[in-house]
Interface confidence: low
Protein backbone atom coordinates (compact mmCIF):
# COMPACT_ATOMS: atom_id res chain seq x y z
CA UNK A 1 0.00 0.00 0.00
CA UNK A 2 1.34 3.42 -0.97
CA UNK A 3 1.13 5.71 2.05
CA UNK A 4 3.56 8.44 1.03
CA UNK A 5 2.81 11.99 -0.02
CA UNK A 6 4.83 14.37 -2.14
CA UNK A 7 5.11 18.00 -1.16
CA UNK A 8 6.21 20.32 -3.95
CA UNK A 9 7.03 23.97 -4.40
CA UNK A 10 3.66 24.17 -6.13
CA UNK A 11 2.73 26.79 -8.70
CA UNK A 12 5.65 29.17 -9.00
CA UNK A 13 6.70 32.05 -11.20
CA UNK A 14 10.04 33.57 -12.05
CA UNK A 15 11.47 36.30 -14.22
CA UNK A 16 12.88 35.71 -17.67
CA UNK A 17 16.66 35.37 -17.43
CA UNK A 18 16.51 34.41 -13.76
CA UNK A 19 16.72 31.09 -12.00
CA UNK A 20 14.32 28.97 -9.98
CA UNK A 21 14.58 26.00 -7.65
CA UNK A 22 12.17 23.11 -8.18
CA UNK A 23 11.76 20.98 -5.08
CA UNK A 24 9.78 17.92 -4.08
CA UNK A 25 9.83 16.07 -0.80
CA UNK A 26 8.51 12.58 -0.18
CA UNK A 27 7.14 11.97 3.30
CA UNK A 28 4.91 9.61 5.29
CA UNK A 29 6.57 6.48 3.97
CA UNK A 30 9.50 4.31 4.96
CA UNK A 31 10.06 3.23 1.36
CA UNK A 32 13.59 3.52 0.01
CA UNK A 33 14.06 6.07 -2.76
CA UNK A 34 16.09 4.42 -5.50
CA UNK A 35 15.87 7.15 -8.14
CA UNK A 36 14.27 10.52 -8.79
CA UNK A 37 13.51 11.63 -12.34
CA UNK A 38 12.84 15.26 -13.25
CA UNK A 39 10.78 15.72 -16.39
CA UNK A 40 9.34 18.65 -18.27
CA UNK A 41 6.25 17.47 -20.11
CA UNK A 42 7.78 14.68 -22.23
CA UNK A 43 11.44 15.62 -21.82
CA UNK A 44 13.82 14.13 -19.28
CA UNK A 45 15.78 16.88 -17.53
CA UNK A 46 17.75 14.97 -14.95
CA UNK A 47 18.06 11.79 -12.94
CA UNK A 48 19.32 11.37 -9.40
CA UNK A 49 20.13 7.72 -8.76
CA UNK A 50 20.82 6.59 -5.19
CA UNK A 51 23.90 4.65 -6.29
CA UNK A 52 25.11 6.47 -9.37
CA UNK A 53 24.40 10.09 -8.43
CA UNK A 54 23.22 12.72 -10.86
CA UNK A 55 22.86 12.62 -14.61
CA UNK A 56 21.82 15.79 -16.39
CA UNK A 57 20.33 15.48 -19.86
CA UNK A 58 22.94 16.79 -22.34
CA UNK A 59 20.47 19.21 -23.91
CA UNK A 60 19.95 20.88 -20.52
CA UNK A 61 23.36 20.60 -18.88
CA UNK A 62 24.22 24.25 -19.42
CA UNK A 63 21.05 25.47 -17.72
CA UNK A 64 20.28 22.85 -15.10
CA UNK A 65 22.10 22.28 -11.83
CA UNK A 66 21.51 19.54 -9.27
CA UNK A 67 20.10 20.50 -5.95
CA UNK A 68 19.36 21.53 -3.37
CA UNK A 69 18.98 17.97 -2.19
CA UNK A 70 16.93 16.01 -4.69
CA UNK A 71 15.64 19.24 -6.21
CA UNK A 72 16.68 20.94 -9.41
CA UNK A 73 17.79 24.47 -10.24
CA UNK A 74 16.89 25.96 -13.63
CA UNK A 75 18.92 28.91 -14.85
CA UNK A 76 18.72 31.48 -17.64
CA UNK A 77 14.98 31.03 -17.82
CA UNK A 78 13.08 31.76 -21.01
CA UNK A 79 9.36 32.09 -21.65
CA UNK A 80 9.56 28.69 -23.32
CA UNK A 81 10.37 27.16 -19.93
CA UNK A 82 6.80 27.86 -18.83
CA UNK A 83 4.92 24.64 -18.22
CA UNK A 84 4.56 21.55 -16.10
CA UNK A 85 7.47 19.87 -14.36
CA UNK A 86 7.30 16.48 -12.68
CA UNK A 87 9.39 14.88 -9.98
CA UNK A 88 9.04 11.11 -10.21
CA UNK A 89 10.20 9.18 -7.17
CA UNK A 90 11.00 5.53 -7.79
CA UNK A 91 10.79 3.73 -4.45
CA UNK A 92 11.00 0.24 -3.03
CA UNK A 93 8.70 -1.38 -2.17
CA UNK A 94 6.00 1.27 -2.70
CA UNK A 95 6.53 1.99 -6.38
CA UNK A 96 6.33 5.36 -8.11
CA UNK A 97 5.25 8.68 -6.64
CA UNK A 98 4.82 11.73 -8.86
CA UNK A 99 4.73 15.40 -7.93
CA UNK A 100 3.73 18.24 -10.23
CA UNK A 101 5.02 21.80 -10.37
CA UNK A 102 3.76 24.48 -12.72
CA UNK A 103 6.31 27.14 -13.63
CA UNK A 104 5.38 30.41 -15.28
CA UNK A 105 8.24 32.50 -16.65
CA UNK A 106 7.31 36.17 -16.78
CA UNK A 107 8.72 38.98 -18.89
CA UNK A 108 8.48 41.61 -16.16
CA UNK A 109 9.41 41.91 -12.50
CA UNK A 110 6.03 40.78 -11.20
CA UNK A 111 7.09 37.21 -10.50
CA UNK A 112 6.20 35.88 -7.08
CA UNK A 113 6.59 32.48 -5.51
CA UNK A 114 3.39 30.53 -5.10
CA UNK A 115 2.46 28.70 -1.96
CA UNK A 116 3.65 25.18 -1.26
CA UNK A 117 0.99 22.52 -1.55
CA UNK A 118 0.73 18.77 -1.17
CA UNK A 119 -0.12 16.18 -3.75
CA UNK A 120 -1.48 13.01 -2.12
Amino acid sequence: MMTGTIETTGNISAEKGGSIILQCHLSSTTAQVTQVNWEQQDQLLAICNADLGWHISPSFKDRVAPGPGLGLTLQSLTVNDTGEYFCIYHTYPDGTYTGRIFLEVLESSVAEHGARFQIP
Epitope: C48, L52, G53, W54, K61, P66, G67, P68, G69, L70
Partner: nanobody, 111 residues
Protein backbone atom coordinates in the same frame (compact mmCIF):
# COMPACT_ATOMS: atom_id res chain seq x y z
CA UNK B 1 25.17 12.22 12.81
CA UNK B 2 25.74 14.10 9.58
CA UNK B 3 27.36 17.50 9.96
CA UNK B 4 28.35 20.18 7.45
CA UNK B 5 30.70 22.82 8.75
CA UNK B 6 31.46 25.92 6.69
CA UNK B 7 34.46 28.14 7.30
CA UNK B 8 36.44 30.87 5.59
CA UNK B 9 33.98 33.73 5.72
CA UNK B 10 34.87 37.21 6.86
CA UNK B 11 35.17 40.85 5.92
CA UNK B 12 36.87 41.68 2.64
CA UNK B 13 37.22 44.78 0.49
CA UNK B 14 35.62 45.00 -2.97
CA UNK B 15 37.83 43.27 -5.49
CA UNK B 16 39.26 40.97 -2.85
CA UNK B 17 39.17 37.20 -2.49
CA UNK B 18 38.02 34.60 0.00
CA UNK B 19 38.04 30.81 0.03
CA UNK B 20 35.19 29.03 1.75
CA UNK B 21 35.40 25.41 2.90
CA UNK B 22 32.64 22.96 3.72
CA UNK B 23 33.62 19.82 5.59
CA UNK B 24 31.06 17.02 5.60
CA UNK B 25 31.22 14.32 8.25
CA UNK B 26 29.03 11.47 9.41
CA UNK B 27 28.12 10.29 5.91
CA UNK B 28 28.07 6.54 5.30
CA UNK B 29 28.70 7.36 1.64
CA UNK B 30 30.41 10.08 -0.34
CA UNK B 31 27.78 12.64 -1.39
CA UNK B 32 27.20 12.53 -5.14
CA UNK B 33 27.22 16.32 -5.25
CA UNK B 34 27.86 19.34 -3.07
CA UNK B 35 26.68 22.88 -3.56
CA UNK B 36 26.86 26.42 -2.24
CA UNK B 37 23.93 28.73 -1.66
CA UNK B 38 23.76 32.20 -0.19
CA UNK B 39 21.22 34.38 1.51
CA UNK B 40 21.55 38.15 1.66
CA UNK B 41 19.68 40.12 4.32
CA UNK B 42 16.02 40.38 3.45
CA UNK B 43 16.35 38.14 0.39
CA UNK B 44 15.60 34.52 -0.45
CA UNK B 45 18.31 31.89 -0.38
CA UNK B 46 19.83 31.58 -3.85
CA UNK B 47 21.92 28.91 -5.47
CA UNK B 48 25.54 29.84 -6.23
CA UNK B 49 27.35 26.76 -7.53
CA UNK B 50 27.35 22.95 -7.53
CA UNK B 51 29.94 20.28 -8.15
CA UNK B 52 29.35 16.61 -8.96
CA UNK B 53 31.53 13.88 -7.48
CA UNK B 54 32.94 13.42 -10.98
CA UNK B 55 34.06 17.05 -11.08
CA UNK B 56 31.41 18.64 -13.31
CA UNK B 57 30.57 22.16 -12.12
CA UNK B 58 27.72 24.65 -12.54
CA UNK B 59 27.58 28.32 -11.63
CA UNK B 60 24.90 30.95 -11.25
CA UNK B 61 25.25 33.65 -13.89
CA UNK B 62 25.97 36.26 -11.21
CA UNK B 63 29.20 34.53 -10.11
CA UNK B 64 30.38 32.89 -13.33
CA UNK B 65 34.01 33.76 -14.05
CA UNK B 66 34.60 35.01 -10.51
CA UNK B 67 33.84 32.01 -8.30
CA UNK B 68 35.27 28.50 -8.58
CA UNK B 69 33.78 25.48 -6.85
CA UNK B 70 35.78 22.32 -6.26
CA UNK B 71 35.68 19.25 -4.06
CA UNK B 72 38.09 16.86 -2.42
CA UNK B 73 36.13 13.62 -2.51
CA UNK B 74 38.54 11.81 -0.20
CA UNK B 75 37.83 14.40 2.50
CA UNK B 76 34.15 14.98 1.66
CA UNK B 77 35.01 18.66 1.51
CA UNK B 78 33.84 21.32 -0.93
CA UNK B 79 35.50 24.65 -1.57
CA UNK B 80 34.33 27.93 -3.03
CA UNK B 81 37.09 30.24 -4.25
CA UNK B 82 35.61 33.71 -4.54
CA UNK B 83 37.53 36.34 -6.50
CA UNK B 84 36.71 39.90 -7.59
CA UNK B 85 34.19 40.14 -4.80
CA UNK B 86 31.48 42.79 -5.01
CA UNK B 87 29.33 44.39 -2.28
CA UNK B 88 26.34 42.48 -3.68
CA UNK B 89 28.12 39.22 -2.81
CA UNK B 90 27.57 40.04 0.87
CA UNK B 91 25.51 37.18 2.35
CA UNK B 92 25.54 34.15 4.58
CA UNK B 93 26.94 31.30 2.50
CA UNK B 94 25.57 27.81 3.09
CA UNK B 95 26.86 24.42 2.03
CA UNK B 96 24.45 21.70 0.91
CA UNK B 97 25.30 18.04 0.45
CA UNK B 98 22.84 15.22 -0.10
CA UNK B 99 20.00 17.26 1.40
CA UNK B 100 21.93 18.26 4.52
CA UNK B 101 22.68 21.91 5.27
CA UNK B 102 25.41 23.65 7.20
CA UNK B 103 24.92 26.57 9.57
CA UNK B 104 26.47 29.07 7.16
CA UNK B 105 29.41 31.46 7.15
CA UNK B 106 29.06 35.21 6.77
CA UNK B 107 30.81 37.00 3.91
CA UNK B 108 30.83 40.78 4.05
CA UNK B 109 32.22 42.78 1.13
CA UNK B 110 32.70 46.38 2.12
CA UNK B 111 35.29 49.14 2.01
Amino acid sequence: EVQLVESGGGLVQPGGSLRLSCAASGFTFSPSWMGWFRQAPGKEREWVASVLRGGYTWYADSVKGRFTISADNSKNTAYLQMNSLKPEDTAVYYCDAADYWGQGTLVTVSS
